[in-house]
């Protein structure tokens, strides 16, 4: 922003009645007075170039420093020719000083050169010479200068000629001051502007109406230069929640649109599923029947729990079951679906059912499932299980109802036996077995089948009721097909791998371990 | 690791015997069974047959289909084994694999027929135009 | 001689969980193998012995065996699990290995 000039003195506009004094009385500067476009304009000039050493001093009222700290002094004079005068005039100058003096107090015509200090010498840019002067066209010179900082109450300035043909048509002090300004929804005071050029005044900007400052954002600053130029913005100011930025100001959100924090952004439509929000809202409240998670932000439309999951089947293996569903066919508008199994076994004898949480294996856990598959093994035979599948989002904890399936399975065979071979010899396999414990009361007996390896037309049977055999009488490093089978009073469980195991070569028959 | 190579003629005329050869790289190269699988193009995998060489004994197992024409052999001083298919026509053109199976044949007794083929040669296309 | 049946195609679309079946006769008394097979590729084994994971496969690749049908898992679908898929066997009556027709996994 431009700097602000705030006028103390204008000799040009005062009309000749300022009335500086000069020294000596009566000699050197003359206030003179001219018609200029049929206007009156006043000078001061002095023209005293043939009489040899000119000491003339022209000061200028005392001047009121207000809140000034520095100011600058503008000048708009003339300068004639040396040349243009006879023999050159020896003791001729085309320069004068600027001088200036603070004190307290009005010295009135009291003048005293020692006070002064000097600001500099003034030298013009362009002379008169002779040949303008006779046509009346004058070369007008305009030179700048600054002081400061200032301390007393008031000044003097003064001008000294020492032998030139000057005439002051102008002298202007300022100072300057940074305007009042709006930035970045920040309002900055005018500010007086400071009178070390290489420093800046940090000047506090306060927020408008409806804005503040973001959290963990900077206060508004601003710098005010010398030159009365606000520089270097710091930190800025946002619209409140429920406000947004048009032009300079922050204004309510219209009706049907909300701001949920203070931010650059500007109001948004409120929306799916919420009802339409009053002049500045901060948010928008959801339909019936719709809910907002805790961690869901504002701008997100309003969402419900899912419907139970689509599609549910329980394939039973043995003793196990995998589960198996398809996502729900209404999410709710959401994608943070969990799937909670849980479990009830029922014993088909007395009809009594309970739940089997601490008696079944999940291949993962059971709640918080983001897979649409879980299986569920140490099922019991001849037991029946009912499954429920529960699909959850953010906003199922707002809700008492709840989005379920079921599915029922009954487990008639057990699970397949896991095989081990124990030991051997040239003409023996000691073969071992387990099945999960819950299963193992079912069994009556084990049914172990057995071949040679690439004989598939003969096989042996042997039936025993512990956990392991020894079948014997095989031929020497023979690999042999081995199935070890439960037997319930039902019928057959399920059958185990078809393993294969080979019997010593007889350079290695002292060895019986496996 | 097992590293597979496999090299060999890419282009054959109908009747003529192809010729495919797989260097094993690291591994006991007698403790597996060696596998060669086929794939003609835009179709389905094939096994074509097996070797073991234990002692001094090859062990052989081809597949049915194409026993009459296939050789499986071994050259154990390189760790190499080789695939010839005999009176070769237009449908023997295929991509033709060598691989390992994920277990040595047996251990302790415990054997692995038909293990799972953990790796797999870069693969050889074989093509029979006349 | 065994015979491994799969269906030609599955689609499934990202995130979701894709299922590839192989029928056979009592194949569950049978180790399943399961591999992927991408364009230009040699086959890389994904799950060994119906459910196991060779080192490097992600735990997203699983595998399930009874009766007459296992089934190969894939949950949390990406585009870069869009492959053919292959069953394999032993075939004890036979002696020999034998592959299933194959699989192509379209992710939509």
């Known amino acids: 922003a431009q700097g602000k000039e705030v006028v103390l003195l204008d000799f040009a506009a005062a009309g000749g009645e300022l009335g500086w004094l000069t020294h000596p009385y009566g000699k050197g500067w003359d206030l003179m007075q001219n018609i200029m476009n049929d206007m009156p304009i006043y000078m001061y000039s002095v023209c005293n170039v043939m009489s040899g050493d000119q000491d003339n001093w022209l000061r200028t009222n005392w001047v009121y420093r207000g809140e000034a700290e520095r100011i600058f002094i503008e000048l708009k004079f003339t300068v004639r020719d040396c040349n243009s005068f006879p023999g050159g005039a020896s003791s001729c100058k085309e320069t004068f000083n600027l001088y200036y003096a603070e004190s307290d107090l009005d010295y009135g015509t009291n003048f005293q050169k020692r006070l002064f200090t000097k600001i500099d010498t003034i030298a013009p840019d362009e002379i008169t010479v002779s040949s303008d002067f006779e046509a009346r066209h004058v070369k007008l010179n305009v030179e700048e200068r600054s002081v400061g900082p200032l301390t007393r109450k008031g000044f003097y300035l003064a001008f000294q000629d020492i032998g030139a043909c000057v005439a002051l048509l102008s002298v202007r002090v300022y100072y300057k001051k940074c305007p009042e300004l709006l930035q970045g929804l920040a309002h900055f005071p005018e500010t007086i502007a400071g009178s070390d050029a290489p420093s800046l005044a940090t000047v506090a900007g306060t927020c408008v109406d409806h804005a503040v400052v973001p959290p963990g954002g900077e206060e508004p600053r601003m710098h005010c230069a010398v030159d009365g130029e606000w520089l270097v913005p710091i930190g800025q100011c946002l619209c409140q929640a429920g406000y947004e930025k048009v032009e300079d100001a922050c204004q309510a959100c219209s009706p049907g649109f909300f701001k949920f924090e203070a931010s650059e952004s500007p109001c948004l439509e409120c929306p799916e599923h919420t009802l339409p929000s009053p002049e500045g809202a901060t948010s928008c409240e959801c339909e019936e029947g719709f809910f907002r998670a805790p961690q869901d932000p504002a701008s997100m439309p309003c969402t419900r729990p899912p419907s139970a999951p689509h599609y549910l089947t329980a394939v039973g293996m043995g003793a196990k079951v995998e589960l198996r569903w398809t996502p729900p066919q209404d999410s709710g508008g959401r994608e943070d679906i969990v799937y909670s199994v849980t479990c009830e076994q029922c014993w088909p004898e007395s009809g009594e059912c309970g739940p089997c949480e601490a008696s079944v294996r999940y291949s993962e856990p059971p709640h918080g499932l983001t897979r649409t598959s879980v299986t569920v093994s140490d099922l019991e035979p001849h037991m029946n299980y009912t499954f429920t599948v529960e699909a959850r989002n953010g906003v199922s904890g707002l809700v008492t109802s709840r989005s379920f399936r079921t599915a029922s399975v009954s487990i008639n065979q057990t699970e397949p036996p896991k095989v081990r071979l124990e030991g051997r010899s040239t003409t023996s396999l000691s073969v071992s077995w387990s099945i999960p414990p819950p299963q193992q009361s079912r069994v009556w007996k084990y049914e172990v089948t057995y071949r040679k390896k690439g004989d598939s037309n003969s096989y042996n049977v042997r039936r025993t009721e512990g956990f392991s055999v020894t079948l014997d009488d095989l031929a020497p490093d023979t690999t042999y097909l081995v199935q070890v089978q439960a037997l319930t009073q039902e019928g057959q469980g399920a059958g185990s791998k078809v393993h294969e195991f080979q019997t010593l070569s007889p350079e290695g028959s002292g060895n019986l371990a496996v | 690791q097992v590293q597979l190579q496999q090299w060999g003629a890419g282009l054959l005329k109908p009747s003529e015997t192809l010729s495919l050869t797989c260097a094993v790289y690291?591994?006991?190269?007698?403790?597996?069974?060696w596998s060669w699988i086929r794939q003609p193009p835009g179709k389905g995998l094939e096994w074509i047959g097996e070797i073991n060489h234990r002692g001094s004994i090859n062990y052989n197992n081809y597949n049915p289909s194409l026993k009459s024409r296939v050789t499986i052999s071994v050259d154990t001083s390189k760790n190499q084994f080789s695939l010839k298919l005999s009176s070769v026509t237009a449908a023997d053109t295929a991509v033709y694999y060598c691989?390992?199976?994920?277990?040595?044949?047996?251990?302790?007794?415990?054997?692995?027929?038909?293990?799972?083929?953990?790796?797999w040669g870069q693969g050889t296309m074989v093509t029979v135009a006349s | 001689s065994y015979v491994l049946t799969q269906p030609p195609s599955v689609s499934v679309a990202p995130g979701q969980t894709a299922r590839i079946t192989c029928g056979g006769n009592?194949?569950?008394?049978?180790?399943v193998h399961w591999y992927q097979q991408k364009p230009g590729q040699a086959p890389v084994l994904v799950v060994y012995?119906?459910?196991d994971r060779p080192s490097g496969i992600p735990e997203q690749f699983s595998g399930s065996n009874s009766g007459n049908t296992a089934t190969l898992t894939i949950s949390r679908v990406e585009a870069g699990d869009e492959a053919d898929y292959y069953c394999?066997?032993?075939?004890?009556?036979?002696?020999?290995?034998?592959f299933g027709g194959g699989t192509k996994l379209t992710v939509l």
């Open positions: 394999q066997v032993w075939d004890h009556s036979s002696d020999h290995v034998v």
């Open positions: 690291g591994g006991s190269f007698s403790d597996y069974y």
């Open positions: 012995d119906d459910s």
């Open positions: 009592n194949i569950g008394s049978m180790n």
């Open positions: 691989a390992k199976p994920l277990r040595p044949h047996c251990t302790n007794g415990v054997c692995y027929s038909g293990d799972a083929f953990d790796i």
